[in-house]
Interface confidence: low
C-alpha cells in the first residue's frame, strides 16, 4: 500500500549466506529473491537488520539445518531472534528448539520464528544458532525478514 | 483498516484439499474458515493464488504431513513456496525440510514458511511438496496465505 | 505507521506463562518483551487476546515443547489456535502436530502457527495444546500475538 | 448441495448399543474431518467425536471415551458412531456434522436422530 512520504513502506527479506567465522550470529545477503524496500531499513555487517523509524514491526527468521544426535551436543539446536537497541543490552525476542535427528548422517529440520516487537530508531535484529555448520544454505532454507505494521 | 477504494486490503487465506491428481503442487479450496478479502487477489484452479496489483506481500504456508522413514523415500519431506511472475520462470521463494520420522505408522510433523516478498501484477504464488499422499488435510493443519503491506 | 485516531494500530504479542491449572489452553502475560498496542486489543484471564474492532488480523503462535515418545500418550503433540466469536461455537483456525521425540529424558521441538482471519469485535482467540505440562517456557520460548492488517 | 442424513437411532436400555450411520452428499466427504455432536433434552450442544480424514486420528469427549467408536467408510461417503455400555446420561439427539472445529462449531449439520436409554 503506497503510504505517502510521511509514511513509507518499511520491509526487508534476506537470504542466509554460509560463513567462515565462527561466530554463532548467521550472516545474511541481499542476494536471490530479497527485499529491501528502502534506506529506513539496512542489512549491516552482513549480520543484522537495522531500522530507523520507531515503531512495531512483524520480525520473523527461518533456519533449516542438519544435525545428527550421535555426531552434535546433547544439547538441541537453538535458533534465537535477538534484539540489540541504543544504549542497551542484547535481548532475546524469540527462540525455538529442535533436538538433533537419529538420521545419517544428520537429518534436516526446520524451525520459524515469528513476532511483533516494538523497535527504537537504530534498534538492530539478528539471528543467533547454537551450531552455524549446521545450517543449510540451499535456495530458500534460511531467510530473516521483517515489515513494519 | 480501511485504506479506502484506491488502496484496499488484499489478503487471503486458503485451505488444503485432499487431491487424487499426482502433481507435487497442492492443492487449496475457500472452504472452512477461509479469507477472501476481494478480488485483488484470487484462487486459480485451486492451486496458485494470483495477484493484480504489484507491490510487497507478507506469504506464508503451513504443511503437516505424517511420513515414516522406512516407508519413504532417504530425502526429507521437503515444502517449497513459489513464484510465477508472467513472462518469466518459476522460482523457489522459501523452502523447509524435515527428515521422516521413526515413529510408526506414521510420524507427524509441521512446516510454516513465511517471508515478504515483491510482486507484480499477475504474479502467482504456490506450494509444492515431495509426496503430497503425506500431506494432513484435517482441520486448520495446512493453509496457505497472504497479506499485502 | 501512525494511522490517525481512525485508524490506530492493532497488535499484541504475549510471552507464555506456566500454570498449575490442568487446563489444556495455554496461558499467557504481558511480561518481558510483550507488546500491547492499545485497548483496542487485550489479554483476558491470561487465555485469550481480544479484539474490540472487526477486521482482517495476521495472528500467531509459536509454542516449543518437550517430549518423549514412550512417556506420552501415542497420540502427537498438537497445537490449535482457536477462534471464539460472540454468540458463536469455539471453531479451530490453525493446528500443528509433531510426534514426540526418542531423545531422552525429553526431546525439545517449536511449532510455528499462523494466519489471516477476518475476527468481529469482542472476538477471542487462544491456543490450545495436548499437554500443557511438556511445554517450554524459557525466554523466548513459547509466545502468542496478533497484528490487525 | 450439502447433505448429512442420520440414521440407526432408537430406544435402548442401559448397557445396551447402538450404531449410528450418516450418509453424507453433496460434497468431497474424502477431504473433511466429520464428527458427531449431542443435544440432550433442555441442554446445549455437546461435542461427541470427531474423526480425520483417512480415518486415522480419532477424537473423543471425555464423557463417551472407551464407550464409543467413531469411524468411517470413505467409499461409501459414509460415517459411523458405535456406541455401547449406554447410559442415561446418553440420551440425546446426535447430529452428524461437518467439518469439526475445535470441539464445537459446524458448517453443516444432519436433522439429527433420536437416541433414547431407558429401562
Known amino acids: 500500500m503506497q503510504k505517502g512520504d510521511q509514511n513509507p513502506q518499511i520491509a526487508a527479506h534476506v537470504i542466509s549466506e554460509a560463513s567462515s567465522k565462527t561466530t554463532s550470529v548467521l550472516q545474511w545477503a541481499e542476494k536471490g529473491y530479497y527485499t529491501m524496500s528502502n534506506n529506513l531499513v539496512t542489512l549491516e555487517n552482513g549480520k543484522q537488520l537495522t531500522v530507523k523509524r520507531q515503531g512495531l514491526y512483524y520480525i520473523y527468521a527461518q533456519v533449516t539445518f542438519c544435525s545428527n544426535r550421535e555426531a552434535s551436543s546433547q544439547a538441541p539446536f537453538i535458533a534465537s531472534l535477538c534484539l540489540k537497541s541504543p544504549g542497551r543490552f542484547e535481548r532475546i525476542l524469540l527462540r525455538a528448539a529442535n533436538t538433533h535427528s537419529s538420521a545419517k548422517p544428520c537429518g534436516q529440520q526446520s524451525i520459524h520464528l515469528g513476532g511483533v516487537f516494538e523497535l527504537q530508531p537504530g534498534a538492530s535484529v539478528f539471528v543467533n544458532v547454537t551450531d552455524p555448520s549446521q545450517v543449510s544454505h540451499g535456495t530458500g532454507f534460511t531467510s530473516f525478514g521483517l515489515l513494519k505494521l | 483498516m480501511q485504506k479506502g477504494d484506491q488502496n484496499p486490503q488484499i489478503a487471503a487465506h486458503v485451505i488444503s484439499e485432499a487431491s487424487s491428481k499426482t502433481t507435487s503442487v497442492l492443492q487449496w479450496a475457500e472452504k472452512g474458515y477461509y479469507t477472501m478479502s476481494n478480488n485483488l487477489v484470487t484462487l486459480e484452479n485451486g492451486k496458485q493464488l494470483t495477484v493484480k496489483r504489484q507491490g510487497l506481500y507478507y506469504i506464508y504456508a503451513q504443511v503437516t504431513f505424517c511420513s515414516n522413514r522406512e516407508a519413504s523415500s532417504q530425502a526429507p519431506f521437503i515444502a517449497s513456496l513459489c513464484l510465477k511472475s508472467p513472462g518469466r520462470f518459476e522460482r523457489i521463494l522459501l523452502r523447509a525440510a524435515n527428515t521422516h520420522s521413526s515413529a510408526k505408522p506414521c510420524g507427524q510433523q509441521s512446516i510454516h514458511l513465511g517471508g515478504v516478498f515483491e510482486l507484480q501484477p499477475g504474479a502467482s504464488v504456490f506450494v509444492n511438496v515431495t509426496d503430497p499422499s503425506q500431506v494432513s488435510h484435517g482441520t486448520g493443519f495446512t493453509s496457505f496465505g497472504l497479506l499485502k503491506l | 505507521m501512525q494511522k490517525g485516531d481512525q485508524n490506530p494500530q492493532i497488535a499484541a504479542h504475549v510471552i507464555s506463562e506456566a500454570s498449575s491449572k490442568t487446563t489444556s489452553v495455554l496461558q499467557w502475560a504481558e511480561k518481558g518483551y510483550y507488546t500491547m498496542s492499545n485497548n483496542l486489543v487485550t489479554l483476558e484471564n491470561g487465555k485469550q487476546l481480544t479484539v474490540k474492532r472487526q477486521g482482517l488480523y495476521y495472528i500467531y503462535a509459536q509454542v516449543t515443547f518437550c517430549s518423549n515418545r514412550e512417556a506420552s500418550s501415542q497420540a502427537p503433540f498438537i497445537a490449535s489456535l482457536c477462534l471464539k466469536s460472540p454468540g458463536r461455537f469455539e471453531r479451530i483456525l490453525l493446528r500443528a502436530a509433531n510426534t514426540h521425540s526418542s531423545a531422552k529424558p525429553c526431546g525439545q521441538q517449536s511449532i510455528h502457527l499462523g494466519g489471516v482471519f477476518e475476527l468481529q469485535p469482542g472476538a477471542s482467540v487462544f491456543v490450545n495444546v495436548t499437554d500443557p505440562s511438556q511445554v517450554s517456557h524459557g525466554t523466548g520460548f513459547t509466545s502468542f500475538g496478533l497484528l490487525k492488517l | 448441495e450439502v447433505q448429512l442424513l442420520e440414521s440407526g437411532g432408537g430406544l435402548v436400555q442401559p448397557g445396551g448399543s447402538l450404531r449410528l450411520s450418516c450418509a453424507a452428499s453433496?460434497?468431497?466427504?474424502?477431504?473433511?474431518?466429520m464428527g458427531w455432536v449431542r443435544q440432550a433434552p433442555g441442554k446445549g450442544l455437546e461435542w461427541v467425536s470427531s474423526i480425520e480424514p483417512t480415518g486415522i486420528t480419532t477424537y473423543y469427549a471425555d464423557s463417551v471415551k472407551g464407550r464409543f467408536t467413531i469411524s468411517r467408510d470413505n467409499s461409501k461417503n459414509t460415517l459411523y458412531l458405535q456406541m455401547n455400555s449406554l447410559r442415561a446420561e446418553d440420551t440425546a439427539v446426535y447430529y452428524c456434522?461437518?467439518?469439526?472445529?475445535?470441539?464445537?462449531?459446524?458448517?453443516?449439520w444432519g436433522q439429527g436422530t433420536l437416541v433414547t436409554v431407558s429401562s
Open positions: 453433496g460434497f468431497t466427504f474424502t477431504s473433511y474431518e
Open positions: 456434522a461437518k467439518p469439526h472445529f475445535t470441539e464445537l462449531g459446524f458448517d453443516y
